[in-house]
């Protein structure tokens, strides 16, 4: 710091000490540091009725640190102000606190919501979607093939979550029902484990579907029930030309 | 809202003095640092002097010093600076502002032209 | 003093492009550096301290670095209400001194 502020000093203080401990540049025995060495900050600790002068490299937490021409000086934060860079701008509120705008509020401003992790109020987040990506093909049970009407989905995605008072996400996928034109299901494509020969029983609304399969079939003689599935299927297929589909997916 | 309101400006002869006045609102004066910064036509800006937040200690650029008095009345939340035997390098806006390490807030300025 | 010494003087940018602000300082400032910025015919307006912290309010665009003595203001995806000047200033050491200025303009 300034010299000549030094002499001043030790002309005031009878008992200033030569031998100063860890940073002061002058000091008495009995407030401690009077003035401090280059860069260092000087604060006074209350330690029981009195201040004694401390030297250090940085200003404690609740302090914030100024250099002076005559001396750097350790300047406390506002009484709510955890960390400062000065008077104007707290960096960290004391518990119980939120930091908005370098300021610490025991509530956060209208439109804003309190961040209990951070302790800052932050601005409140509503959900935000994409839009929706196109509808999926006519499905049932998994398949693509062999039914009349089935169920289509689409989905779309969450690019914002919202926090804590921000609106919910919307649903995120639709389903609908759709019909569409019966596609016989080729070979493998119903994909029944073991290759089972065992009829399903239709559903609700789905008439019989022959299995074609030669495989373990000794003759080509058709049994009564083959002849009626096959006529049962030439039935259909004129019904199907003269049902338009209402799907809005193409069968893949 | 803070607000620093200047005033006093003017044309001035060299040599002549002047006092400048900015009047605060919007914070507690009393405990801010306060300075003046400067600011010749299409320069850049210049630091003149400083006052602790209770006067008690002063501070100025070495160009104004025994010139230039920075004062304040706490009571009336109002800084001064009285700037006597002026030059015509004095000639600037002169903006008042609070002075805690950086220079936060800021007046609107206040012109002084010094010239014959 | 502490010579603060800020390049380009001015400098011409089109909407949307990055420009770069340089400042020395004659000695070591550690971090005590801020920038301002002033839009024509107004005061200047602090945009940061401590070399890269943002005063609230100031758009995410700009951003400071540096240490020692080599500083530098940064400005992405210039935008016309970003037409002023900047300075830079130490306040490490008084008296505080300022850079002489860029002045900003738009191609």
């Known amino acids: 710091q300034n010299a000549s502020r030094g002499r001043r000093q030790r002309r005031m203080h009878p008992n200033v000490s030569q031998g100063c401990q860890g940073g002061c540049a002058t000091c008495s025995d009995y407030n401690g540091c009077l003035s401090c060495k280059p860069r260092l900050f000087f604060v006074l600790e209350r330690i029981g009725m009195k201040q004694i002068g401390v030297c250090l490299s940085s200003c404690p937490s609740g302090y914030y640190g100024t250099r002076y021409p005559d001396i750097n000086k350790c300047t406390k934060c506002k009484a709510d102000c955890d960390t400062c860079f000065n008077k104007n701008f707290c960096t960290k509120c004391k518990s119980g606190f939120y930091l908005h705008l370098g300021k610490c509020l025991d509530n956060c401003p209208e439109g804003l919501e309190a961040n209990n992790h951070t302790m800052e109020c932050v601005n409140i987040v509503h959900c935000e979607v994409s839009e929706w990506n196109p509808w999926s093909p006519c499905t049932k049970k998994g398949k693509t093939c062999g039914f009349k009407r089935g169920t289509e989905t689409r989905v779309r995605e969450i690019m914002q979550h919202p926090s804590a008072k921000g609106n919910l996400c919307p649903p995120t996928n639709e389903t609908r029902k759709c019909t569409v034109q019966r596609k016989k299901c080729q070979k493998g494509e119903r994909g029944k484990k073991g290759r089972e020969r065992k009829r399903k029983k239709p559903n609700k609304g789905e008439s019989k579907e022959a299995i074609p399969d030669s495989k373990g079939l000794e003759s080509s003689k058709e049994t009564p029930e083959q002849r009626e599935n096959k006529q049962q299927q030439k039935k259909r297929k004129v019904q199907d030309k003269q049902q338009k589909s209402v799907s809005v997916s193409t069968v893949h | 809202e803070v607000q620093l309101v200047e005033s006093g400006g003017g044309l001035v002869q060299p040599g002549r003095s002047l006092k400048l006045s900015c009047a605060a609102s919007?914070?507690?004066?009393?405990?801010?640092?306060m300075a003046w910064v400067r600011q010749a036509p299409k320069k850049g800006l210049e630091w003149v002097a400083t006052?602790?937040?209770?006067?008690?200690?002063?501070y100025y650029r070495d160009s104004v010093k025994g010139r230039f008095t920075i004062s304040r009345a706490n009571a009336k939340s109002t800084l001064y600076l009285q700037m006597d035997s002026l030059r015509s390098e004095d000639t600037a806006t002169y903006y008042c502002?609070?002075?805690?390490?950086?220079?936060?807030?800021w007046g609107q300025g206040v012109m002084v032209t010094v010239s014959s | 003093d502490i010579q603060m010494t800020q390049s380009p003087a001015s400098l011409s940018a089109s909407l949307g492009e990055t420009v770069t602000i340089e400042c020395r300082a004659s000695?070591?400032?550690?971090?005590?550096l801020a920038w301002y910025q002033q839009k024509p015919g107004n005061s200047p307006q602090l945009l940061i301290y401590?070399?890269?912290s943002l005063i609230h309010g100031v758009p995410s665009r700009f951003s400071g670095s540096g240490s020692g003595t080599q500083f530098s203001l940064k400005i992405n995806n210039l935008q016309s209400e970003d037409v002023a000047s900047y300075f830079c200033?130490?306040?490490?050491?008084?008296?505080?001194?300022f850079g002489a200025g860029t002045k900003l303009e738009l191609k």
């Open positions: 502002a609070t002075h805690d390490k950086t220079f936060d807030y």
């Open positions: 919007g914070f507690t004066f009393s405990d801010y640092d």
């Open positions: 006052i602790i937040y209770d006067g008690s200690r002063t």
């Open positions: 000695e070591d400032i550690y971090s005590d």
């Open positions: 401590d070399v890269n």
């Open positions: 200033q130490q306040y490490d050491n008084y008296p505080n001194t």
